[in-house]
């Protein structure tokens, strides 16, 4: 009876999300494997988040709007492990917008989700950021490693969206 009611709840939750995400990929987790964590298909999952790589070339503002429409934000990178996971799926000859910007050019970098900007957990390429005119951050492959660079916000780039996993 308990299992039946849990299944019914799950199905109604799935139907609720179905209007936003036509397909979800879910995995069982938790100590009793009773919880399901889901990401929209074909997003990838890492820890408690889902990631989507957009190959549409857009400005930073349009990229953020694009993520927002999908219930996400441009990616906020919190750890080296997270960055390493993300970069596995990136192309080395491309650049991708991050959810990091400095809209006033005061070198006050801010994340789109208001996560505090921690200078100790940043992965700027050597010598970057280097221009107060360049107010948006990308991740790209340079000098044999992935790192961040400041660029003009209106220059179209690919982008990475991030959202919290859906738990049902």
């Amino acid at each position: 009876n308990f299992m039946y009611s849990k299944t019914v709840k799950r199905l109604s939750k799935l139907q609720e999300y179905q209007q936003y995400y036509p397909s979800l990929t879910c995995v069982m987790e938790g100590k009793d494997m009773e919880d399901w964590s889901c990401c929209p298909t074909p997003w990838t999952s890492f820890q408690s988040s889902c990631y989507f790589i957009s190959t549409v070339m857009q400005s930073w503002t349009k990229s953020q709007n694009n993520c927002s429409v999908m219930g996400a934000d441009l990616v906020v990178i919190n750890t080296k492990e997270e960055q390493d996971f993300i970069t596995q799926n990136l192309k080395i000859n491309s650049a991708y917008f991050l959810g990091l910007s400095d809209p006033k050019g005061w070198r006050h970098w801010q994340w789109v989700d208001q996560t505090p900007y921690n200078k100790n957990v940043t992965f700027w390429h050597s010598g970057e950021p280097n221009s107060p005119d360049e107010r948006c951050a990308i991740i790209n492959f340079r000098s044999e490693e992935w790192g961040w660079n400041d660029v003009h916000c209106h220059v179209p780039q690919k982008s990475i969206c991030k959202m919290k996993k859906i738990y049902i």
Partner: antibody, heavy 121, light 111 residues
Framework: EVQLLESGGGLVQPGGSLRLSCAAS????????MSWVRQAPGKRLEWVAT????????YYPDSVKGRFTISRDNSKNTLYLQMNSLRAEDTAVYYC??????????????WGQGTTVTVSS | DIVMTQSPDSLAVSLGERATINCKAS??????????VNWYQQKPGQPPKLLIY???NLESGVPDRFSGSGSGTDFTLTISSLQAEDVAVYYC?????????FGGGTKVEIK
């Protein structure tokens, strides 16, 4: 007073090359992102190229990508536009302009008087 | 590319009267409360001159008879009381996304 002085325009045959220069004074040139904008006779203004203050990032529209190269020499306060494989449709007055950011966008706040490029056989 | 469409192509206004120029973007050029549209004035034989940035901010040194308004896709430049020195072509431009694009221009003349 800000002054931008373009030079290097002239008559060139299709397929030919030309190098435009823009000498800047009255600004700390090395701190400015710079752009080239052109205006063909009777046509709307068209953005041609942008280069950041350090010269390490350059941007072009598809219409000139691969043919035009923007560069700068901060020690000489000079901006350049190398134009190769010129076509009749590149005929225009070419202006250099200073770029000023505005949040996520920008404005072109100071403009030179322009130099005329004519591509014709 | 974002297409900027200006109207009218030309405008004849009496001295001291109001002139209104419209500009329509093919998609929104707004983000987070700011609109990325600029207005320039170009007099014959001269380079363009910045008048308005961010849709409604008056550039330093520009007379306050010039004003800009609008958001999203629809923008307006208004000259509240036309002066003889305002005879020129006026262009809108979006800087939200490369390639930056300009409107086709509106020629303002005295009636």
């Amino acid at each position: 007073e800000v002054q931008l002085l373009e030079s290097g325009g002239g008559l060139v045959q299709p397929g030919g090359s030309l190098r435009l220069s823009c000498a800047a004074s009255g600004i700390t040139f090395s701190t400015y992102t710079m752009s080239w904008v052109r205006q063909a006779p009777g046509k709307r203004l068209e953005w041609v190229a942008t280069i950041n203050s350090g010269g390490d990032n350059t941007y072009y529209p598809d219409s000139v990508k691969g043919r035009f190269t923007i560069s700068r020499d901060n020690s000489k306060n000079t901006l350049y536009l190398q134009m190769n494989s010129l076509r009749a449709e590149d005929t225009a007055v070419y202006y250099c302009a200073t770029y000023r950011p505005y949040y996520y966008g920008s404005v072109l706040d100071y403009w030179g008087q322009g130099t005329t490029v004519t591509v014709s056989s | 590319d974002i297409v900027m469409t200006q109207s009218p192509d030309s405008l004849a206004v009496s001295l001291g009267e109001r002139a209104t120029i419209n500009c329509k973007a093919s998609q929104s050029v707004d983000y987070d409360g700011n609109s990325y549209v600029n207005w320039y004035q170009q007099k014959p034989g001269q380079p363009p001159k910045l008048l308005i940035y961010g849709a409604s901010n008056l550039e330093s040194g520009v007379p306050d008879r010039f004003s800009g308004s609008g958001s999203g896709t629809d923008f307006t430049l208004t000259i509240s009381s036309l002066q003889a020195e305002d005879v020129a072509v006026y262009y809108c431009q979006q800087s939200d996304e490369d390639p930056w694009t300009f409107g086709g221009g509106t020629k303002v003349e005295i009636k």
